[in-house]
């Protein structure tokens, strides 16, 4: 599987799951999330050869023929498989609230 | 809706459905397919500008932080959102067989 | 180009305050982490705290909690460093550092250092 | 806290050679890690970010590899110039501690 445990491990030029931090204020402007101060959002990067981690008929056939075709330029692309919810503290006035932001952490990827 | 509908009809530089024919002997090299000959795969490309179409709470962070830092490499990718089967007649021997492989046609796309 | 450039040498009593200051220039400065970083003569690199100053959030370590105060002002670009109830071993080189784009806390332009020296 | 420890604190090399310094965080720190370079009286410079991405301007000798808990920092080629104290730093979490450095000579 393309995710952390095998990504961040390796020097992987295709497809995978890469580490990418991301700071709140600095990075988005969001200057209303008070904690955490960031997070590893992660993304994902990388040539997509045919059959690699392949997420549809489409992306197989997509797969082979930008293969055949080298030249071409359609091929699969490599974009988020599982994502996970981040918890984030935030402060409405003095009230404080928790809230769980879904599909914020990319665990791992396909070629789509 | 990032569909047929709207981008094989307008110059759209950003995400969007392309049209691409594939021809099963030329483009595959299979020969096995009897019916149709080829079929209107296509496929999807353009940038992703913060919040075009975006997949995901993720792909929204992503679109932004790309945005402000520019110079950075992780950004969301125009993937396939609604794929269609498509009918194909192929033979075993002499014996005729129609089939409906899924997920084979591209009808929209989305920023992932 | 991006500086960053910190006020002169102290001496101060022990029991005293220090303010240090850290001057900012060629970026937007109330859109990057300053941090703050101590180095005792001869001796390791020592993470104190850090400032947003878009909004004035800080961060600091434990060990200097209570004793240290970073604040800063968009209207000059600058970064300050409190340290209160100075002591023999606050003697030391003060560094303000800026976080860079693109990464965790890594710090990609340094001040030139403040030297801070604690006798009696 | 996090703890970083840095090994060796000091080594004498011949120039031209290989230089490796590690470093071992108490706990995982995923790819977190910075390395600096420090000369005599001047101050600290950032060399590797995300453990092994070289920054701007940065000569191509030194590099930088790791992931989770074990570090190691590269001089391929060691040069006159290099001579310095590196430092790595996680940047995993606060507080964003340091190596406690390892001193680069010249043999």
């Known amino acids: 599987a393309l995710d952390t445990n095998y990504c961040f491990r390796n020097l992987e030029e295709n497809c995978c799951v890469r580490p990418l931090y991301i700071d709140f204020r600095q990075d988005l402007g969001w200057k209303w999330v008070h904690e955490p101060k960031g997070y590893y959002a992660n993304f994902c990067s990388g040539p997509c050869p045919y059959l690699r981690s392949a997420d549809t008929t489409h992306s197989t056939v997509l797969g082979l023929y930008n293969t055949l075709n080298p030249e071409a330029s359609a091929s699969p692309c490599c974009v988020p498989q599982d994502l996970e919810p981040l918890t984030i503290l935030y402060y409405v006035g003095r009230t404080p609230k928790v809230e769980q932001l879904s599909n914020m952490v990319v665990k791992s990827c396909k070629c789509s | 809706a990032l569909d047929t509908n709207y981008c094989f009809r307008n110059l759209e530089e950003n995400c969007c459905v392309r049209p691409l024919y594939i021809d099963f002997r030329q483009d595959l090299g299979w020969k096995w397919v009897h019916e149709p000959k080829g079929y209107y795969a296509n496929f999807c490309s353009g940038p992703c500008p913060y919040l075009r179409s975006a997949d995901t709470t993720h792909s929204t962070v992503l679109g932004l932080y790309n945005t402000l830092n520019p110079e950075a490499s992780a950004s969301p990718c125009c993937v396939p959102q609604d794929l269609e089967p498509l009918t194909i007649l192929y033979y075993v021997g002499r014996t005729p067989k129609v089939e409906q492989l899924s997920n084979m046609v591209v009808k929209s796309c989305k920023c992932s | 180009q991006v500086q960053l450039v910190q006020s002169g040498a102290e001496v101060k009593k022990p029991g005293s305050s220090v303010k240090v200051s850290c001057k900012a220039s060629?970026?937007?400065?109330?859109?990057?982490?300053i941090h703050w970083v101590k180095q005792r003569p001869g001796k390791g690199l020592e993470w104190i705290g850090r400032?947003?100053?878009?909004?004035?959030?800080?961060d600091y370590s434990e060990k200097f909690q209570g004793r240290v105060t970073i604040t800063a002002d968009k209207s000059t670009s600058t970064a300050y460093m409190e340290l209160s109830s100075l002591r023999s071993e606050d003697t030391a080189v003060y560094y303000c550092?800026?976080?860079?784009?693109?990464?965790?806390?890594?710090?990609?332009?340094w001040g030139q250092g403040t030297l801070v020296t604690v006798s009696s | 806290d996090i703890q970083m420890t840095q090994s060796p604190s000091s080594l004498s090399a011949s120039v031209g050679d290989r230089v490796t310094i590690t470093c071992k965080a108490s706990?995982?720190?995923?790819?977190?890690v910075a390395w600096y370079q420090q000369k005599p009286g001047q101050s600290p410079k950032l060399l590797i970010y995300?453990?092994?991405n070289r920054y701007t301007g940065v000569p191509d000798r030194f590099s930088g590899s790791g992931y989770g808990t074990d570090f190691t920092f590269t001089i391929s080629s060691l040069q006159a110039e290099d001579v310095a104290v590196y430092y790595c730093?996680?940047?995993?979490?606060?507080?964003?501690?340091f190596g406690g450095g390892t001193k680069v000579e010249i043999k």
């Open positions: 550092a800026r976080r860079m784009i693109t990464t965790q806390a890594a710090l990609d332009y």
């Open positions: 060629g970026y937007t400065f109330s859109s990057s982490w």
């Open positions: 400032i947003y100053p878009g909004d004035g959030d800080t």
């Open positions: 706990q995982s720190v995923i790819n977190a």
């Open positions: 995300y453990a092994s």
């Open positions: 730093q996680q940047d995993y979490s606060s507080p964003y501690t």
